[in-house]
């Protein structure tokens, strides 16, 4: 019951953050207008990963697209890579986890299958954490240094005089959504591995039985497989628990209900 | 067609209270912010504030702050402003006006305060 | 609060003839997150409601006739009537559109001679 909680909330809590990392993803306010020079501007300036927006006096508000791939920062692209590539993998983790869920039944799959699936949605979840935690650490580490750099030009110019006040930018709301998004998913993805762990089935301890035949001794050894994947088992005729990696041309057919701790 | 339409002329009292009115119809009346204006007689352009319809936001020129206090119904799609305490130099003409970079102004309201 | 200044306060030209009205401000109206200038021109004639000609410096309000013309960045900028008409005869305003308090210069009357 507890494995079954902590799965379905794993996967709950998974699903808010990859909706926040979209939401956070779509979002224009990735930087917004640092208003402590001017906090009397009638324009206001906001900037997302895909446009950029003008607020004005009226309440209009203009939005344009950057219409341009090769005359962006390279540090842009890389948090939008790093956004996608967290919602690729949120997204595909989303689809094995409702199939890996405890309380869903598709046909006779058996638990070490769905331990299986957890673990690997848990995983992706992780993974498609960091994804957007990073993308959105490397344009908050953009936006600082950039502040501090027009804060350091601001008053520099031609005797002194400046008569555009440089518009410095500070961290938007996407960045705050972008950070809790991806520990949400981060806290799920981790919640889906405990839960692996507690959806296979306990590791059964066989007492060594000796066999004889034809005068050879095979002893069947406790415990098995523990490093293996999951998807299948030995088919070859050597049918030894050993406990050891396998080669890599054995062929996998069906999952066995040992192979997972 | 946008048109804004203001509540017709007012003579008060000095020290009394005006209300007037300006209704919005057109456009989407909580997509723009509605600006208000003073026009003494034979003077140029003085800005009052402004009101979000949408949330009821609202920011005053500090001129007139404590003078003037905007307000909306977004039922019927008005603005008021209401001016307290009035005095002699609050003689004037009263524009609400709204719309990208003000296309569109009401016709005005003369307030005329006079003992 | 950033100060408009107009010149000259009245105008006189003869009809046919170019008119050129100037508006400086105190700081400069240019936005950097767009790169336009928030400086906007009006026409007010007696007894009516100002009218909208001229948006970011340059821009014609739709139905303005071409011989309105608006130029200038930063903290100069210039109104041109290229051919002044009798229907032209107003006064001018030119406003801050980029910082509260909003504010308008103090108007150009501009006359036939």
């Known amino acids: 019951m507890a494995v079954t909680a902590c799965q379905g909330l794993g996967f709950v809590v998974s699903l808010i953050g990859i909706a926040g990392i979209i939401a956070a993803t779509c979002m224009d306010q990735w930087s917004t207008q640092d208003l402590y020079n001017n906090p009397v501007t009638a324009v206001f300036n906001y900037q997302g990963l895909w446009r950029s927006c003008v607020r004005e006096s009226s309440g209009f508000t203009e939005c344009r697209g950057y219409f341009t791939l090769l005359g962006l920062p390279a540090m842009l692209q890389a948090v939008r890579a790093l956004m996608i590539v967290g919602i690729v993998l949120g997204a595909i983790g989303l689809l094995v986890s409702i199939f890996a869920l405890k309380c869903i039944r598709i046909g006779s799959m058996e638990d070490s299958a769905k331990a299986n699936m957890t673990l690997t949605s848990g995983i992706m979840f992780i993974v498609s954490g960091l994804c957007a935690i990073a993308g959105v650490s490397v344009f908050a580490n953009m936006l600082v240094t950039n502040f501090w750099m027009s804060t350091a030009n601001m008053y520099t110019g031609m005797g002194g005089m400046v008569q555009t006040v440089q518009t410095r930018y500070t961290f938007g709301a996407a960045l705050f959504v972008g950070w809790v998004a991806g520990g949400l998913t981060l806290i799920g993805g981790v919640m889906m591995c405990i839960a692996c762990r507690g959806l296979a089935p306990e590791e059964t301890n066989y007492k060594a039985v000796s066999y004889h035949a034809s005068g050879h001794s095979v002893a069947y050894k406790p415990g098995g497989f523990k490093a293996s994947t999951g998807f299948g088992s030995n088919t070859k005729n050597k049918k030894i628990y050993d406990g050891g990696a396998r080669t890599e041309d054995e062929v996998q057919s069906y999952p066995s209900k040992h192979d997972y701790v | 067609q946008v048109q804004l339409v203001q509540s017709g002329a007012e003579v008060k009292k000095p020290g009394a209270s005006v209300k007037v009115s300006c209704k919005a119809s057109?456009?989407?009346?909580?997509?723009?912010?509605v600006h208000w204006v003073k026009q003494a007689p034979g003077q140029g352009l003085e800005w009052i504030g402004y009101?979000?319809?949408?949330?009821?936001?609202?920011k005053y020129n500090e001129k007139f702050k404590g003078k003037a206090t905007l307000t909306r119904d977004t039922s019927t799609s008005t603005v008021y402003m209401e001016l307290s305490s009035l005095r002699s130099e609050d003689t004037a003409v009263y524009y609400c006006?709204?719309?990208?970079?003000?296309?569109?102004w009401g016709q005005g309201t003369l307030v005329t305060v006079s003992s | 609060d950033i100060v408009m200044t107009q010149s000259p306060d009245s105008l006189a030209v003869s009809l046919g003839e170019r008119a050129t009205i100037s508006c400086k401000s105190s700081?400069?109206?240019?936005?950097?997150?767009?790169?336009?200038?928030?400086l906007t021109w009006y026409q007010q004639k007696p007894g009516q409601a100002p009218k909208l000609l001229i948006y970011?410096?340059?821009t014609r309000e739709s139905g303005v006739p071409d011989r309105f013309s608006g130029s200038g960045s930063g903290t100069d900028f210039t109104l041109t009537i290229s051919s002044l008409q009798a229907e032209d005869v107003a006064v001018y305003y030119c406003?801050?559109?980029?910082?509260?308090?909003?504010?308008f210069g103090g108007g150009t009357k501009v006359e036939i001679k």
């Open positions: 006006l709204s719309l990208r970079f003000f296309a569109y």
């Open positions: 057109g456009y989407t009346f909580t997509n723009y912010f």
């Open positions: 009101i979000n319809p949408y949330n009821d936001d609202t």
């Open positions: 700081q400069s109206l240019l936005n950097s997150g767009n790169q336009k200038n928030y």
């Open positions: 970011w410096a340059s």
């Open positions: 406003q801050n559109d980029y910082s509260y308090p909003l504010t």
